[in-house]
């Protein structure tokens, strides 16, 4: 799903070859064409590993290969977040980490990857065919989610290879925003080029681009948007899903966690601008005016009321007590 297409060596015409007006109209197409060719969709990878030491203990690692700043990561099991999945952990880059049993330990590994260790015993322990999903909310792409599970015959200590986004899913924030502009730009570009073709023009230095230059990938965002809106989720065997989790706030974490709807990844404008969102039916999308988007799905049975989030004015270090110490 990652589409970092190589930009063909396009050569804009030399300024002296056309009048000022003509030059200006030709600059935009080159810019747009570059955008069209390089436009890509982010990719999320998920790796699930059963620990050799504790046979029912799992490590889930997830990473985001997009270009934006991550504003929230949600790890769930039993299906995608908001589509029947149960939230295991939520990681916020400035407010710390919140986790629910049987999650034992969620951590950032790098700025764009996280890991989660799951407890191996008890009624809510995972089993080999459990599906784990990671959802990354980022600015400006929106939310991207991928799911993975252990291969059926996994040996302990072995891991499933990282799975790049088996569930194609991107929220309208990224798709309709960026992709819409790019799609419009690309169409406009074609229109300009076609118009330019039919108009007698001075001879331009031919571009060195081969006719086989990678064009197909330029349309990835619009393909993604169509797929995201039409591809149904995979049916997931949920025989190992836990009972509803009633340990919603085991560490008495700060109030913002209590008010964080665990079904949705809210994308803040900046590090501290949060918003709560109404919750329509599963699979629908909510767009909020000033660039705040949230993928909306059904509220899992264990979540509290969807209250508005207020950032802690003291910043992340104020969170240490409840979040850091177990």
């Amino acid at each position: 799903m990652r589409t970092e297409a190589q930009v063909p060596a396009l050569q804009p015409p030399e300024p002296g070859l056309e009048g000022a007006m003509g030059h200006r109209t030709l600059v935009l197409p080159w810019v747009l064409l570059t955008l069209c060719v390089t436009a890509g969709t982010p990719e999320v990878w998920v790796q699930v590993r059963m620990e050799a030491t504790e046979l029912s203990s799992f490590t889930i690692r997830c990473g985001f290969l997009g270009s934006g700043s991550i504003s929230l990561v949600t790890v769930s099991w039993g299906g995608p977040n908001g589509a029947g999945g149960t939230t295991l952990a939520v990681l916020h880059p400035e407010r710390g980490i919140r986790q629910w049993a049987p999650a034992r330990q969620a951590r950032w590994e790098t700025q764009s990857s996280i890991s989660l260790i799951l407890e191996g015993s008890g009624a809510s322990s995972p089993c080999a065919n459990t599906t784990f999903c990671c959802k990354f909310a980022s600015f400006p792409e929106g939310s991207w989610e991928a799911c993975g599970s252990l291969p059926p015959s996994s040996d302990p200590g072995l891991s499933a290879p990282p799975t790049p986004a088996p569930i194609l899913r991107a929220d309208l924030a990224g798709i309709l925003g960026v992709s819409g502009v790019l799609l419009f730009g690309c169409v406009y570009l074609l229109h300009l080029l076609r118009r330019h073709k039919h108009r007698p023009a001075p001879r331009l230095q031919p571009s060195r681009t081969s006719p086989q230059a990678p064009r197909a990938r330029a349309w990835a965002p619009s393909q993604a948007s169509q797929a995201a809106l039409h591809v149904p989720y995979a049916t997931i065997n949920t025989s190992c899903r836990p009972a509803t989790l009633d340990t919603a706030h085991p560490h008495g974490g700060p109030s913002w966690w209590a008010s964080l709807p665990t079904h949705a990844a809210h994308r803040p404008q900046g590090p501290a601008a949060w918003a709560s969102t109404p919750i329509p039916a599963r699979g629908s999308f909510v767009s909020v005016e000033n660039g705040l988007y949230a993928q909306a799905g059904e509220r899992p049975p264990h979540t509290g009321p969807g209250l508005t989030l207020f950032p802690d004015p003291r910043g992340p270090r104020a969170m240490e007590g409840p979040l850091g110490v177990r």
Partner: antibody, heavy 118, light 107 residues
Amino acid sequence: EVQLQQSGAELVKPGASVKLSCTASGFNIKDIYMHWLKQRPEQGLEWIGRVDPTNGNSEYDPRFQGKATLTADTSSNIAYLQLSSLTSEDTAVYYCARFGIYPYFDYWGQGTTLTVSS
Amino acid sequence: SIVMTQTPKFLLVSAGDRVTITCKASQSVNKAVVWYQQKPGQSPKLLINYASNRYTGVPDRFTGSGYGTDFTFSISTVQAEDLAVYFCQQDYSSPWTFGGGTKLEIK
């Protein structure tokens, strides 16, 4: 209050080994990765590696493989950096820094000065 | 490993000046770049993460930008207390690497 308290300055002879400590307070080291960094006088920072206190797994910059050994004792909330076969090139300030609750080094130790001299 | 080339090495400026430091990665690191400030005799302190996000409590005269391989860090109006060494760092892939540092001195 979150703190990373590092052991005191060390003066050791070439060829010897040394073990530096980083005592964490205000949080559980199982919740983070402990990273170690090296800074030579008037030079940049070099990443030595990181240890996962949960399982003792460690990862190193290839330049420090064989030179450094990272360990952690979760019962006492202490991370360790052991350096072996010391030479004058190892003279530097060594820092521990935590990463994991947030996706960046939000807390650093005060640094331990290691001087290797005969 | 990814090499982070930071320029310039030294900056001698007057209070009130604007300064810009650049960091170039040897390969794309997306936005996984952090900027630190290290004052004399102290440990480094985080200023910017994700290439452009100002850390809590960091004055807004400090800004970062960039994506891929080219990153910049600016101080819009230098103040006397900004005397320090500034480092960029990538954590896109292991081993994590730092720029060589820029020593900012005030005239």
